[in-house]
Each structure stands twice: as C-alpha cells, then as structure tokens.
C-alpha cells in the first residue's frame, strides 16, 4: 500500500521516463545555477513537498537528488541564509520503512545526517547547515535540478 506522496513521486518519475528523446543540456538555462554537472533552481516561493515535486516536473527537471556529503556541502554553500529550508527529492517510504529518493533508490545512511524522525508523511529539507525531516505538508522552498550532460538522454519506450 503506497502513500499518496509515494504514488505522486512514482507517477511523475514514470512520466519523465516516457518523454521523447532530446539533446542533453549543454548549459544551464537562465536563472538556474550551475553546480558541477548539474543545474539548480532555488525557488523563491513555498509549497508542500508534493507540489514542489510537481513544479520541478513541469520544468522538465526533478527535485534535487544528492549523491554524497560533498555534493550536499556544495549545495548548502549556495543557500544565502540560515533561516531558509528547501525540499529535496527524498521522503519516507512507509511501505519500505526507509528514506527513498524520488528516482527509486534508498538513502545510504552515511550520505546525510538527518535531524528528526523517520516516519509517515516525513520529507527531507536542507538548510545552510543541516538536513531535516519535516512534515511533507509544510510549505517551504524547494530545489529543482537538471543534469548537465552533452550526451543524449536515454529513452524509455512506452509500455
């Protein structure tokens, strides 16, 4: 039994996999910031987690996926104030009782030191200094990402 947030996450990821082939992104679009091989868009408005997820999808991007501690630190360095929280693409999967990235992978416990509870309706936010579990209904800012790559995107055929 999947929660509504899990279903939303899966639906959006599947729809992204079904998009037509297009060239890889060579440069970051206007208003997006380059961080290594990614383009990041830091929202100025606030939304619950699932609306943030949907917003990134409409921008042909995804909520931020963080590979490791190093990428986390570099992302946090771009946050201008300690009192801003941003949603990323990680939430608690009730069915699997674990933190799950929106690409379907599970959190490596060494990657992020999460402050707060791992429980139903918990989603992950980052600040300038820390990583927090917040209620997914909380309205905060969010970060979208686009992969910066010269190669063509892999296309998944419609099923």
């Amino acid at each position: 039994q999947k929660s509504s947030i899990e279903k939303c996450s899966v639906d959006i990821q599947q729809s992204r996999n079904k998009t037509t082939e297009r060239p890889g992104l060579l440069n970051c679009p206007i208003y997006w910031q380059q961080l290594r091989e990614k383009c990041l868009l830091f929202s100025h408005t606030v939304n619950p987690w699932n609306n943030s997820l949907a917003d990134c999808s409409t921008k042909e991007s995804s909520l931020l996926l963080i590979r490791d501690k190093d990428e986390l630190i570099h992302t946090q360095n771009l946050i201008r104030d300690k009192a801003i929280l941003f949603w990323i693409g990680l939430n608690f999967s009730l069915s699997e009782k674990n933190w799950k990235w929106i690409n379907g992978s599970f959190l490596n416990s060494n990657d992020l030191e999460i402050r707060g509870d791992a429980k139903e309706n918990s989603c992950i936010s980052i600040s300038q200094t820390s990583v927090y579990s917040e209620y997914c209904s909380t309205e905060i800012r969010w970060i979208c990402q686009k992969e910066l790559t010269p190669v063509r995107n892999k296309v998944y055929p419609d099923s």
Epitope: K82, A83, R115, G116, S125, S133, E134, Y135, S137, T138
Partner: antibody
Framework: EVQLVESGGGLVQPGGSLRLSCAAS????????MSWVRQAPGKGLEWVSA????????YYADSAKGRFTISRDNSKNTLYLQMNSLRAEDTAVYYC????????????WGRGTLVTVSS | DIQMTQSPSSLSASVGDRVTITCWAS??????LNWYQQEPGKAPKLLIY???SLQSGVPSRFSGSGSGTDFTLTISSLQPEDFATYYC?????????FGQGTKVEIK
C-alpha cells in the same frame, strides 16, 4: 479558527528564569514554523526566535542567543520559550506568532503575555 | 543586519483621508516586505505580505507597493478603526527586523 494563547509571563528577578507557553489550535500545528516576537513597553516589535515545523531547526536573535531556548511539542500543539539569565531589558510583552522561516510573514498572533524583570 | 526605517514616525489625519506610509530597507530585500497594524493593547495583525499581496480578510482600502529598498503602504480612505500603529517587516534575511512604527492619529 486559528488561535494562539500565550501563558507563563509574570514578575521575575534579574538573573531568574521563566518558561513561556503558547497553545495553538485551529490549524495543523506541526506543518508551520513558529516564532516568538516581543515588544518592550511603549516600543516597537522585536523578533526573538523561530523554530521549524518539526522543531528540528531553530534560530535566534543575537539578544536571545545563549539565554533563550525555543522548543515545541507537536503532540500537545504547544510552543515554548525557556528564558534564563533574564535582564531588565527583557521586560516586554511576548507574542507567539505563526511563521518565521524565510519568506514567511507572521500571519497569526497570540494576545501576548507580559514578562517583567525587576528586583 | 538589515535596518528598516519608516516615515513618518507619526501622522494626524481625518476619516476619509488618503494616507501613505513609507518604509526603507538598508539593502535590497526584493519583495520580502510585510505590513502589520497594531491597535493599542492588542496584538499586531498582518495586512500586506510580499510587498503588495493583501492578507485574507483585510479591507481593500489597504494596499502595498514597492520592491528593492523602497516600499509604501497606502490607506485609500481612512476609517475610524484604522487609527493605530503600522509596522513594516523584512523577511529577506535573518534576523527578521521591523521598522520603528508609524502611529496614525486622529486630527
């Protein structure tokens, strides 16, 4: 209807401690950042401290750092402010307000509780 | 810290008057500016958020404008219940700071 009701104010000697409470109702408390804002007699508004919805993240004005601690109990829909090493200049009406993480405005306020620090 | 300065500190006006209060920020705060009304002995009340958005339930005679460093609160036709103190506040960066207030009195 959103309601915020502060309590715990009173007269305390310099160097003393006090714990303020704010009982919230009418909204999903755990989904909102909360703040304490104070107003000295006849003066303007001064933000004191804020906490995220989960309570995991907190931050303070310089005047409160090291002396005040903000916390919340989401199971009781209650916000707290533990005030230690109180000074005469902490005398004020303390308001509980909803909001406090950028770019939140304070959209609901309690009526306030008066803290008087005097010997 | 970002300093917020309001002008005037006080003003006298009559019912029906158009009233304008100005708020300046010591650095650019984009549109992260809120306006509050406080009646004597009461808690502040949010009027305008994000510089120009009217808070739900607030009469349309209140309006806000501006961005960057200069902001204005306008009351198009002053009503008896509008005699109060008005504060601007920035939510661009911490610490959150308020203007010193503008007291609107009856002429």
């Amino acid at each position: 209807e959103v309601q915020l009701v502060e309590s715990g104010g009173g007269l305390v000697q310099p160097g003393g401690s006090l714990r303020l409470s704010c009982a919230a109702s009418g909204f999903t408390f755990s989904s909102y950042a909360m703040s304490w804002v104070r107003q000295a007699p006849g003066k303007g508004l001064e933000w004191v401290s804020a906490t995220s919805g989960s309570g995991g993240s907190t931050y303070y004005a310089d005047s409160a750092k090291g002396r005040f601690t903000i916390s919340r109990d989401n199971s009781k829909n209650t916000l707290y402010l533990q005030m230690n090493s109180l000074r005469a200049e902490d005398t004020a009406v303390y308001y509980c307000a909803r909001g406090g993480y950028l770019p939140d405005a304070f959209d609901y306020w309690g009526r306030g509780t008066l803290v008087t620090v005097s010997s | 810290d970002i300093q917020m300065t309001q002008s005037p500190s006080s003003l006298s006006a009559s019912v029906g008057d158009r009233v304008t209060i100005t708020c300046w920020a010591s650095q650019s705060i984009s549109s992260y500016l809120n306006w509050y009304q406080q009646e004597p002995g009461k808690a502040p009340k949010l009027l305008i958020y994000a510089a120009s958005s009217l808070q739900s339930g607030v009469p349309s005679r209140f309006s806000g404008s501006g961005s960057g460093t200069d902001f204005t609160l306008t009351i198009s036709s002053l009503q008896p219940e509008d005699f109060a103190t008005y504060y601007c506040q920035q939510t661009y960066s911490t610490p959150l700071t308020f203007g010193q207030g503008t007291k609107v009195e009856i002429k």
